[in-house]
């Protein structure tokens, strides 16, 4: 789910189980041999699998947790072949005779096996035959295998948690992208769809779950009645990456929807007993109904299980009919969870349930089109969640959460287009690189733009047609454009300037986005590829010369204007954008277009004037847009930085969340660049002045912080008020944090701090405090029952101002008994976000890179987030040299999924150095003048 889907599958140490036959010599592999190529040949297609798995949840004599498996795959031969190539990773087969048995189905004659081998580099099991398999014939290949049930969060893996003082062990799966092959031999590509009959053999006191319901009840294993056999119904035709099976002692809360679909939320027995699954249960039914309606297709399976796992690397995973989640993405405790925890639960559920149709029923043929799968779900998650929580205005949150967040990356010269040619995506590492913010958030942004200019009704019509046409099949993004085009062609009210494909090609095949510049004196409008660093060199060519076909909406003096299309030309003119001297015009209403806007200086001044006199005339999203765009434009030298800062002056009269959030996230860059310099004092003073009215507003509204505002956006605004007031030294706020935390320390059983305010109060109290406060919070983390509470404490512990405490804390991240592997990156990043912790975290990452890479390489460590996190403040020549040295020093180890992030960090550091040189003086003077 979203940027948290860190599914990196490369660089996993070989499991220490019995040796297998492998071919190594990666460099000299003969590419003409199909087993040395990463893509499967299409000579054989899987029809069905029968897979039996038996996980052992106690260690064997060697201290290893293992699983044993048996698979029978039925193959249809398409072309004559004397070799069977099937994925297999870290699985051990018998060393006696051949690794597999081959049989003909019906009258198919089967050639003898010559030899079998494992090719480690391409992750294949290869069966060489003495004769050829024949087209049109079916064959069955049987294999038995053994693998390690490791705690590596990939394939069939082990998760551990404590119940009281008892360690509990469960077995679960994470197949996406390329780890189904780590659980059983399979044709592990998304277009190789087949049906699956899964059987789990498990201890009889545990529950077995899979994609489908069980066939009847579990039966005792004849040879050992302490074990049960659970056989599941046959799945529909599906991709391997969506398989899931889990053996645990989890419990569930259930309901049956009107359409007969069984909905269950599974979690640790304690969590279920305390009602932490109820919110998820309450929203799942409505969200499933919403999507069935949105897609005009009923839910394709008989049941919908969702399970919260203690060790889980992604945010969540959309396995068909058995969705897996991090605990904090599914469980909600009204007593200790904040409104943002609740928002996360409903949006992540909506994201994963959106995939049950888009992605699961209809699947992209190859990982190069991942952006459509994830971008689509990242857009419609807001629609599904909005249906479940209609009073929250959730749809607005895509603007800060996805649109502007990804624009910061997409405005770099090192960005890349949404669409990558299939032939450039082959290895597990290359597939892993597809899971980035461009795929998720830019994907979401351009699909939202498309839905907006088509209108939602027309979009839904084309979408339903696409889903009906390709159910149980595979597609490319062009298939969706084609079905949307059919919907456009069948009506007359929506007129497009070109085909859906032609318009969308501009947004998917070239990186970046345009800045639209308006001259309101003449009505001239122009477009240009927007780069945060105006001098950076774009080496990637574009077939469209970095011009887009841009849908433009606008408001003039508060009145909505006609829709306008800027064709893929650099300049045009229209009177829609021409104003009289006292008027103003504002483009990109509600930021439905994926672009930024610049105006002539007079129009900027008129907008500022409007905001300072009567801000309600401008829609709330556009009040945020004015701030976001102007700060970005200032970074790119397209407007003076003082103009952007002037656009924050109206905030002392602003109560809404989004404009404040825009300012805080824009100014967070200023903090990163200046919180080690003399600019920071006047900057804090200015922010104190601006936030004080907001702080006082909420102090009154909440009766001195004893109640909460009613709606979500106001609750978020209250959190911002306290967070900004405290971090900028407003004395009333610092006293509030200290008082509340002291109160809690004196009575640990009764936490007086409302869940919404905990993150910010904890952080500020720990920052003001010393070892006592830190150790108290660490103690609370150790006994935290709910992961949401643990997350808040873990993050707050990084707020300390004591170097030795922060260094000790960094050490804890390498001990999985103290900090779970899944939380290690975010903990190091939290420490790095603290100005005092930043150099410590950077030193730590440099010193421990090899260890981090080797111990955490199997998908449990988001290296791109880590590199980004520890280098965010870099803005000096010395830091640039350090970064270049770090790159040199670790070329042998590599950077895995962080390879691209390292290049971006180098580029960003150079840009930061330049920006500080240019802006320090003028920013210092502006803050002095306005504070």
């Amino acid at each position: 789910y979203a940027q948290e889907k860190n599914k990196n599958a490369e660089h996993v140490p070989q499991a220490p189980t019995s040796p297998t036959i492998t071919t190594t010599a990666a460099i000299t592999l003969d590419q003409s041999k199909p087993w040395n190529r990463y893509r499967l040949p299409t000579t054989l297609l899987p029809d069905s699998y029968n897979v039996t798995l038996r996980p052992y949840l106690t260690p064997n004599a060697d201290g290893l947790y293992i699983f044993k498996g048996k698979s029978i795959v039925r193959l249809l031969c398409q072309e004559p072949t004397d070799v069977i190539i099937i994925h297999s990773k870290k699985l051990n087969y018998t060393t006696q005779g051949h690794m597999v048995v081959l049989r003909g189905v019906g009258d198919s004659q089967v050639p003898e096996i010559d030899r079998t081998e494992l090719v480690e580099l391409t992750e294949y099991l290869v069966v060489h035959l003495k004769g050829s398999l024949q087209p049109g014939h079916m064959y069955e290949m049987e294999s038995e295998f053994q693998g390690e049930l490791a705690d590596d969060l990939a394939g069939f893996y082990r998760s551990e948690y404590m119940e009281g003082n008892v360690k509990k062990v469960l077995a679960t799966t994470q197949m996406q992208s390329t780890d189904a092959r780590k659980s059983f031999p399979c044709f592990d590509e998304p277009a190789m769809k087949a049906t699956f009959n899964i059987t789990l053999i498990h201890p009889n006191n545990l529950t077995a779950l899979s994609n489908m319901p069980p066939k009847g009840s579990s039966t005792p294993l004849a040879e050992d009645p302490n074990w049960s056999v659970t056989e599941f119904e046959t799945t529909p035709v599906m991709s391997t990456y969506l398989l899931a099976y889990i053996v645990s002692e989890f419990q569930s809360v259930n309901e049956t929807a009107q359409n007969g679909v069984l909905i269950r939320i599974w979690a640790r027995p304690n969590a279920i007993a305390e009602g932490h699954g109820m919110y998820a249960l309450n929203v799942t039914g409505p969200i499933l109904n919403f999507f069935a309606n949105h897609y005009n297709t009923s839910y394709p399976l008989p049941k919908s299980d969702q399970i919260a796992l203690p060790d889980f690397n992604a945010g969540a995973m959309e396995n068909w009919g058995l969705v897996t989640y991090r605990e904090n993405a599914l469980l909600f405790d009204p007593q200790s969870s904040s409104i943002s925890n609740k928002e996360r639960v409903v949006t992540v559920i909506a994201h994963e349930l959106a995939h049950q149709w888009f992605g699961n029923l209809v699947t992209l043929a190859w990982w190069n089109d991942l952006w459509l799968n994830e971008g689509f779900a990242s857009y419609v998650e807001y629609l599904g969640a909005d249906h479940a929580e209609p009073t929250w205005n959730l749809k607005d949150l895509i603007v800060p959460g996805d649109v502007y967040r990804v624009m910061a990356v997409d405005a770099l010269a090192s960005s890349h287009p949404l669409t990558t040619p299939a032939e450039e995506v082959n290895t597990p590492a290359q597939i892993s690189e597809m899971f980035d913010s461009i795929s998720y958030s830019k994907g979401a942004s351009v699909i939202r733009m498309l839905s907006n200019f088509l209108t939602e009704d027309l979009f839904k019509e084309g979408l339903a047609s696409y889903l009906h046409a390709f159910a149980y099949q595979n597609t490319t993004y062009l298939d969706l454009w084609e079905h949307l085009q059919k919907a456009v062609d069948a009506q007359t009210s929506i007129r497009l300037p070109d085909t859906v494909r032609a318009i969308m090609d501009r947004w998917t095949l070239q990186m970046g986005f345009p800045v639209i510049t308006v001259d309101t004196k003449t009505g001239n409008i122009s477009q240009k590829h927007f780069l945060l660093d105006s001098e950076s060199n774009v080496t990637r060519s574009s077939a469209f010369d970095y011009l887009w076909i841009v849908p433009i909406s606008s408001i003039k003096n508060g009145v909505m204007q006609d829709h306008y299309w800027l064709r893929d030309v650099s300049q045009a003119q229209n009177d829609l954008f021409k104003t009289a001297s006292d008027d103003w015009v504002l483009l990109n209403v509600n930021v439905t277009g994926y672009f930024q806007v610049n105006y002539d200086e007079d129009n900027w001044r008129m907008i500022q004037h409007q905001l300072q006199t009567n801000l309600s005339v401008i829609p709330v999203i556009n009040r945020a847009q004015v701030i976001y765009d102007s700060f970005n434009l200032a970074t790119a030298h397209m407007v003076p930085v003082t103009l952007a800062l002037d656009n924050t002056l109206f905030l002392n009269g602003e109560k809404e969340y989004m404009p404040w959030q825009a300012a805080l996230s824009s100014l967070s860059y200023f903090s990163l660049m200046f919180d080690r310099s003399e600019v920071y004092g006047p900057m804090k003073k200015y922010l104190r002045k601006q936030v004080e009215p907001l702080f006082q507003h909420f102090e009154t509204l909440t009766k001195n912080w004893t109640e909460r505002p009613e709606n979500l956006m106001d609750q978020y605004s209250e959190i911002n008020a306290i967070s900004t007031a405290c971090s900028n030294g407003l004395p009333q706020c610092e006293n509030l944090a200290k008082t509340l935390f002291d109160q809690w320390m004196s009575d640990p059983e009764n936490n007086p701090i409302h869940p919404n305010l905990r993150s910010t109060i904890y952080c500020n109290a720990i920052a003001q405090g010393g070892q006592d406060q830190w150790d108290f919070a660490w103690g609370q983390l150790q006994q935290a029952q709910l992961v949401n509470e643990a997350d808040k404490l873990r993050s707050a512990l990084a707020c300390s101002n004591e170097v030795w405490l922060l260094n000790r804390y960094l050490g804890y991240t390498l001990n999985p008994d103290l900090i779970r592997k899944q939380d290690a990156t975010s903990t190091i990043n939290s420490i790095a976000s603290n100005v005092i912790g930043q150099p410590l975290a950077w030193d730590f990452v440099q010193s421990n890179w090899k260890k981090l890479f080797q111990d955490y390489g199997g998908g449990s460590f988001s290296f791109s987030n880590l590199i980004q996190g520890v280098t965010r403040r870099f803005s000096s020549e010395f830091e640039l040299q350090q970064l270049e040295q770090f790159k040199k020093n670790n070329m042998d180890v590599g950077f895995g999924s962080g390879t691209r992030a390292l290049e971006q960090a180098l580029e960003k550091t150079k840009a930061n150095i330049k920006w500080v040189k240019e802006n320090k003086e003028v920013v210092l003077n502006w803050f002095i003048e306005h504070s």
């Epitope: 039996t52 018998t94 005779g97």
Partner: nanobody, 124 residues
Framework: QVQLQESGGGLVQPGGSLRLSCAGS????????MGWFRQAPGKEREFVAA????????NYADSVKGRFFISRDDAENTVYLQMNSLKPEDTAVYYC?????????????????WGQGTQVTVSS
């Protein structure tokens, strides 16, 4: 080279139970499919039960299905045959065998390593 040694045979009354063990030595049997065969006086050696190298596949002769259960313990390098509801016609010398493959077979010729056998007599 794998050496196999059966034990656990003996005299038992009809309806009784016995558990035969087959201990491997010389080399681990963990990668081999293992089988039990029997030979009554004057008859050919016949298949009784087999188990694959992982233990996930078991095969039984129709005459013993539901009464006999084969299992393996790779840590102990041992294969077992639990025999319940024994009948006089189960009387025979029982042989343990290892296959040079991980996959089960019912055919005597597919097994390359054999034990010496253990006598099972079912009589009142």
């Amino acid at each position: 080279q794998v050496q196999l040694q059966e034990s656990g045979g003996g005299l038992v009354q009809p309806g009784g139970s016995l558990r035969l063990s087959c201990a491997g030595s010389g080399r681990t049997i963990s990668n081999h499919a293992m089988g039990w065969f029997r030979q009554a006086p004057g008859k050919e050696r016949e298949f009784v039960a087999a188990i694959s190298w992982t233990g996930l596949t078991t095969n039984y002769a129709d005459s013993v299905k539901g009464r006999f259960f084969i299992s393996r313990d790779d840590a102990e390098n041992t294969v077992y045959l639990q025999m319940n509801s024994l009948k006089p016609e189960d009387t025979a010398v029982y042989y343990c065998a290892a296959r040079q493959s991980g996959y089960v077979s019912k055919f005597v010729d597919d097994y390359g390593y054999w034990g010496q056998g253990t006598q099972v007599t079912v009589s009142s």
